[in-house]
C-alpha cells in the first residue's frame, strides 16, 4: 500500500526498489568489518568505529550525520588486579581459583583489549562465606528457599545459574535476601544444546566460556548519575551513593568448568525438585556450605572493578522527509559490544548499515521519504541502554511531539528457525502485511511467503492462521522510546525453535566466542536470514516513513486491551473473598476498554472514508494515530519506577526482558496474600485499576472526532 504521490517521484522508487537494493553479500561484508576487534563502550576502538560509521553514512547519501556524545558512568575490571573467586581452606589458603580469562578463539589469540568476563557495575569487595545455590535466582526461587525450605541467605554468597530472567533481577533478589555476594554461571542445561559441539566446532558454549553483562536495576533511568536528564557538559551528577540502580554486593560471572568445582562440593539441603537441577555432574545441593569433608572450606570473591565517568558516542544520521520533515521514524541499534559482537550487536549493526545504504541509493536517484528517517548507532547499550536513553532525554521535547515510530535493530539473529517480532499492537497489521509480501528464507518454504513460514513455525496462541507477536519488554534500546516517551515501537529478528531449544538466549551470548566465524560457519552462511531481517526492519521503516496514512491499526489495541483486562481480572479473582471485603471492582476498566473498542472501530471507519487529498485532514488523522501510543503514558510513572510511564506495558518487575500488561495492577496484586497490611494492599489495587481505567478512557477519547 506504499504510495508515491506525495513525494512526486517515479513509480520505480517504491518499497520494491528499496528492498531489491538490500544485498546479503553487503551485510556479510559489513559484519566482518565490524567484528575484527572489540568495540567496548568508552574505548578508543569504539570511538573510531563511530567515526567510520559517520563517514560511511555520509558517503551513502544521508543529509547529515552527527556524533552525539555524553559522559556517563561505565564500569571496567582493574587491569592489574583481576577479578576471581577462590575456594579457601581453614587456613585461608586459596586451594582453587576461577579463570581470569576465557581461552581466546582460534585466530584471535593475539587480539589485545579483550575485556575479561565481569559483571559490570559490581562494587569492589572480597566477601567470604558459605555458598547457597539459588537456581535461577528468580523471585519464585527465593520464595522456595526462604518460605518452603527455610534456608536463610543472609550473610551467604549465592551462586545462581544464568537464564530465564535478566541478570540484574537476580542480583536484586539476592540483595533483598541478604546475600553478601553473587556468583553467576552458565549451566550446560541452559547454554549447551544437545547434539551440538562447543565453539570452535559448533555454536555451543565451551566450559571456559563466560557471559558478561551489566547487573543494574535502572528501571529506565539511563546514566545512573543523571536520571531524567542528559549527561552533557554542564550536567549535575549525583554522588555514587545516590546513583540509580547500582548493586550493593559483589557479583562475578563464571563458566561451567569453574562452576563444577564450586558446586561439586555443595552440601546442605538436596534440591527441592528436578527443576533445580542443571546438566553438570553435581548433586545441585542447595547448601548452605560444603559437604562433610569440605565443610571447613569457604568461598571467597575478589572483585576490584571500578566505576568511571566515560565519554560515549552515538551516531545520528538524518534523511529529511519531503512532505512531513517534522515527523520522525527512527531506526536504531547499538554499536558497542562486550568483545567482538559477532551477533550482539554487529549482526544488527550490519543490517542497519545496509538499510542506510539502500535508502541512500534511492535518495541519490532523486527519491525522498515522505517523513524524516533518523538512523542511530547507539553507544553503551550493554551498560544499561545509556546512549539511546541520554539522547532521548536530550531530545525528549522533539521526540514526544514528532516521534512517529521507533524500530529497534540489535542482533538480527538468535537462531535460524523463524521470525520473532515484539511490537506495539498498532504495528500488528503492518507486520502482517509486510511479511505476506516477503519471501521466506526457510528450507521447505521455497516460493512461500515469510508470513506463511512464520505462522507455521510460530503460531499465535490466540488466533489461528496468524503468527505469534509478543509484548515489548526491555533490555534493549527501544525502552526509552516506548516505555518512557510512548512512541510506537517494534523489533524483529530471526530466532531459534523455542520448543526444542530450551536454553536461554543463544549459548555464546556475551562471550569471547561471539565472532564473525560463529555467524558465517554455524548460523547463517548465506546471510539469507540477515537479509530477511533487513527486509522486515527496513520494510517497516519504509512503510512508516512513506505511507500517506500511517500504517497503524488502533482496533488491534482494542483487542489486546480486552485480553489484558481479562487476564488481570482473573489474577485478582484468585482472591474472591478479599475482593468482596475491600469492594474491588474492575467495572471501570472493562467499561473503558469497551469504550475504546467502539471509538477505535468508528475511527477506523472514518480512516477509510476521509479525503486523503486534504492535507489538513490527513495530518489530523495521522496525528491521532501517532499520538495514540503517547496517550497511554502516565506522566507520574509507575510506583517506584518513574521512567516506566506506559500504563499498558512495562518491563516485568521480576524480569526486565519480559513485558507485563497492566503492570501497575499486576504489581499491586503480586504476592498480595503475604502483605502485612491487606487493607492498604487492596487499596493500592483499587488505585491502580482507577489509573488504568482512566488512561484507557483518555486514550479512547483521543480517537474521537475532534469536534
Amino acid at each position: 500500500k506504499s504510495s508515491n504521490e506525495a513525494t512526486n517521484i517515479t513509480p520505480k522508487h517504491n518499497m520494491k526498489a528499496f528492498l531489491d537494493e538490500l544485498k546479503a553479500e553487503n551485510i556479510k561484508k559489513f559484519l566482518y568489518n565490524f567484528t575484527q576487534i572489540p568495540h567496548l563502550a568508552g574505548t578508543e576502538q569504539n570511538f573510531q568505529l563511530a567515526k567510520q560509521i559517520q563517514s560511511q553514512w555520509k558517503e551513502f547519501g544521508l543529509d547529515s550525520v552527527e556524533l552525539a556524545h555524553y559522559d556517563v558512568l561505565l564500569s571496567y575490571p582493574n587491569k592489574t588486579h583481576p577479578n576471581y573467586i577462590s575456594i579457601i581452606n581453614e587456613d585461608g589458603n586459596e586451594i582453587f581459583n576461577t579463570s581470569l580469562f576465557e581461552p581466546p578463539p582460534p585466530g584471535y589469540e593475539n587480539v589485545s583489549d579483550i575485556v575479561p568476563p565481569f559483571s559490570a557495575f559490581s562494587p569492589q569487595g572480597m566477601p567470604e562465606g558459605d555458598l547457597v545455590y539459588v537456581n535461577y535466582a528468580r523471585t519464585e526461587d527465593f520464595f522456595k528457599l526462604e518460605r518452603d525450605m527455610k534456608i536463610n541467605c543472609s550473610g551467604k554468597i549465592v551462586i545462581a545459574r544464568y537464564g530465564k530472567v535478566f541478570r540484574g533481577n537476580k542480583v536484586k533478589n539476592a540483595q533483598l535476601a541478604g546475600a553478601k555476594g553473587v556468583i553467576l554461571y552458565s549451566d550446560p542445561a541452559d547454554y549447551f544444546a544437545p547434539g551440538v559441539k562447543s565453539y570452535p566446532d559448533g555454536w555451543n558454549l565451551p566450559g571456559g566460556g563466560v557471559q558478561r553483562g551489566n547487573i543494574l536495576n535502572l528501571n529506565g533511568a539511563g546514566d545512573p548519575l543523571t536520571p531524567g536528564y542528559p549527561a552533557n557538559e554542564y550536567a549535575y551528577r549525583r554522588g555514587i551513593a545516590e546513583a540509580v540502580g547500582l548493586p550493593s554486593i559483589p557479583v562475578h560471572p563464571i563458566g561451567y568448568y569453574d562452576a563444577q568445582k564450586l558446586l561439586e562440593k555443595m552440601g546442605g539441603s538436596a534440591p527441592p525438585d528436578s527443576s533445580w537441577r542443571g546438566s553438570l555432574k553435581v548433586p545441585y545441593n542447595v547448601g548452605p556450605g560444603f559437604t562433610g569433608n569440605f565443610s571447613t572450606q569457604k568461598v571467597k570473591m575478589h572483585i576490584h572493578s571500578t566505576n568511571e565517568v566515560t565519554r560515549i558516542y552515538n551516531v545520528i544520521g538524518t534523511l529529511r522527509g519531503a512532505v512531513e520533515p517534522d515527523r520522525y521514524v527512527i531506526l536504531g541499534g547499538h554499536r558497542d559490544s562486550w568483545v567482538f559482537g559477532g551477533i550482539d550487536p554487529q549482526s544488527g549493526a550490519a543490517v542497519v548499515h545496509e538499510i542506510v545504504r539502500s535508502f541512500g541509493t534511492l535518495k541519490k536517484e532523486g527519491w525522498r521519504p515522505r517523513r524524516t528517517i533518523l538512523f542511530a548507532s547507539w553507544d553503551a547499550e550493554e551498560f544499561g541502554l545509556l546512549g539511546s536513553t541520554e539522547w532521548a532525554e536530550e531530545n525528549s521535547r522533539l521526540l514526544q511531539e514528532r516521534g512517529v515510530a521507533y524500530i529497534n535493530a540489535d542482533s538480527s539473529i538468535e537462531g535460524n528457525y523463524t521470525l520473532r517480532v515484539d511490537c506495539t499492537p498498532l504495528m500488528y497489521s503492518l507486520v502482517h502485511n509486510l511479511t505476506k509480501e516477503l519471501k521466506s528464507p526457510d528450507e521447505g518454504f521455497e516460493g512461500k511467503s515469510l508470513y506463511e513460514s512464520w505462522t507455521k513455525k510460530s503460531p499465535s496462541p490466540e488466533f489461528s492462521g496468524m503468527p505469534r507477536i509478543s509484548k515489548l519488554g526491555s533490555g534493549n534500546d527501544f525502552e526509552v522510546f516506548f516505555q518512557r516517551l510512548g512512541i510506537a515501537s517494534g523489533r524483529a529478528r530471526y530466532t531459534k525453535n523455542w520448543e526444542t531449544n530450551k536454553f536461554s538466549g543463544y549459548p555464546l551470548y556475551h562471550s569471547v566466542y561471539e565472532t564473525y566465524e560463529l555467524v558465517e560457519k554455524f548460523y547463517d552462511p548465506m546471510f539469507k536470514y540477515h537479509l530477511t531481517v533487513a527486509q522486515v526492519r527496513g520494510g517497516m521503516v519504509f512503510e512508516l516513513a512513506n505511507s500517506i496514512v500511517l500504517p497503524f491499526d488502533c482496533r488491534d489495541y482494542a483487542v489486546v486491551l480486552r485480553k489484558y483486562a481479562d487476564k488481570i481480572y482473573s489474577i485478582s479473582m484468585k482472591h474472591p473473598q478479599e475482593m468482596k471485603t475491600y469492594s474491588v471492582s474492575f467495572d471501570s476498566l472493562f467499561s473503558a476498554v469497551k469504550n475504546f473498542t467502539e471509538i477505535a472501530s468508528k475511527f477506523s471507519e472514518r480512516l477509510q472514508d476521509f479525503d486523503k487529498s486534504n492535507p489538513i485532514v490527513l495530518r489530523m488523522m495521522n496525528d491521532q494515530l501517532m499520538f495514540l501510543e503517547r496517550a497511554f503514558i502516565d506522566p507520574l510513572g509507575l510506583p517506584d519506577r518513574p521512567f516506566y510511564r506506559h500504563v499498558i506495558y512495562a518491563p516485568s518487575s521480576h524480569n526486565k526482558y519480559a513485558g507485563e500488561s497492566f503492570p501497575g495492577i499486576y504489581d499491586a496484586l503480586f504476592d498480595i496474600e503475604s502483605k502485612v497490611d491487606p487493607s492498604k494492599a487492596w487499596g493500592e489495587v483499587k488505585r491502580q485499576i482507577y489509573v488504568a481505567a482512566f488512561t484507557v478512557q483518555a486514550a479512547a477519547e483521543t480517537l474521537s472526532e475532534v469536534a
Partner: antibody, heavy 120, light 106 residues
C-alpha cells in the same frame, strides 16, 4: 577406569612409514579432542597434533604437517597417527593424550606411550 | 610460536626446602599448565589454569603468575616430588612446552 593405550611403535628405516594407534576406554571418546605428544630420548615434551571431536578439524606442529596425519574413528574409540617419510629426529616415545578443554590442549589423561625408532 | 623458558633446568634440593620453578613466555598467555613426569612414566597433569591443583596433587604445591611470568612452588619438598616438571601454554597454536626442570633430592 579412563584409559589410553598406544600401539604400533617400532623400528623403521628413514623414509619409511608407521601408523600409531591409540585405544580409548572408560569415557565417551567422541566428546573429546585428542592429541599426540612426543618425547625424544632424554629430551622434553613436544606437541605433535590435535584433532577435534569428529575429525573434521586437525592441527599440527608446522614442521610435521606435510608428513604426519592425525585421524580418529569414533565408532572404534580409536585415535591414529600416520607418519610418513620418517627421519631420525622423529625417534621418540609417542603419547596419546585426551584434551580436556577442547581445541586448547590441556592434557588430563595420557597413555603409557609407544616407542618409535627411526634408524638404518 | 610462543617459546616457554623454564628456570632452572636442574635443581638439587633437600627435603622440607621451599622450591620455586619459573616459566617465562615469549609473549603473553592466558594461563599456564604444569605437568609432572617421573622416569619411565607418562606425564601427569599437575596444575591447570595457572593456579589450580589437578586431582590428587598435594596441597604443598601451588601455582601463580599472569601474562608472561608464571611460577610453580613447592612449599616443603618431599622425596616423592623428585621428578621433571614441564610448563605448557594453550593460548595459541602450536601448543608448546617448556624444556623442563628436573628436581633431584639431595
Amino acid at each position: 577406569e579412563v584409559q589410553l593405550v598406544e600401539s604400533g611403535g617400532g623400528l623403521v628405516q628413514p623414509g619409511g612409514s608407521l601408523r600409531l594407534s591409540c585405544a580409548a576406554s572408560g569415557f565417551t571418546f567422541s566428546d573429546y579432542y585428542m592429541a599426540w605428544v612426543r618425547q625424544a630420548p632424554g629430551k622434553g615434551l613436544e606437541w605433535v597434533a590435535n584433532i577435534n571431536y569428529d575429525g573434521s578439524s586437525t592441527y599440527y606442529l608446522d614442521s610435521l604437517k606435510s608428513r604426519f596425519t592425525i585421524s580418529r574413528d569414533n565408532a572404534k574409540n580409536s585415535l591414529y597417527l600416520q607418519m610418513n617419510s620418517l627421519r631420525a629426529e622423529d625417534t621418540a616415545v609417542y603419547y596419546c593424550a585426551r584434551d580436556l578443554d577442547g581445541y586448547y590442549g590441556y592434557f588430563d589423561v595420557w597413555g603409557q606411550g609407544t616407542t618409535v625408532t627411526v634408524s638404518s | 610460536e610462543i617459546v616457554l623458558t623454564q628456570s632452572p633446568d636442574f635443581q638439587s634440593v633437600t627435603p622440607k626446602e621451599k622450591v620455586t620453578i619459573t616459566c617465562s613466555a615469549s609473549s603473553s598467555v592466558s594461563y599456564m599448565y604444569w605437568y609432572q613426569q617421573k622416569p619411565d612414566q607418562s606425564p601427569k597433569p599437575w596444575i591447570y589454569r595457572t593456579s589450580n591443583l589437578a586431582s590428587g596433587v598435594p596441597s604443598r604445591f601451588s601455582g601463580s603468575g599472569s601474562g608472561t611470568d608464571f611460577t610453580l612452588t613447592i612449599n616443603s619438598l618431599e622425596a616423592e616430588d623428585a621428578a621433571t616438571y614441564y610448563c605448557q601454554q594453550y593460548h595459541s597454536y602450536p601448543l608448546t612446552f617448556g624444556q623442563g626442570t628436573k628436581l633431584e633430592i639431595k
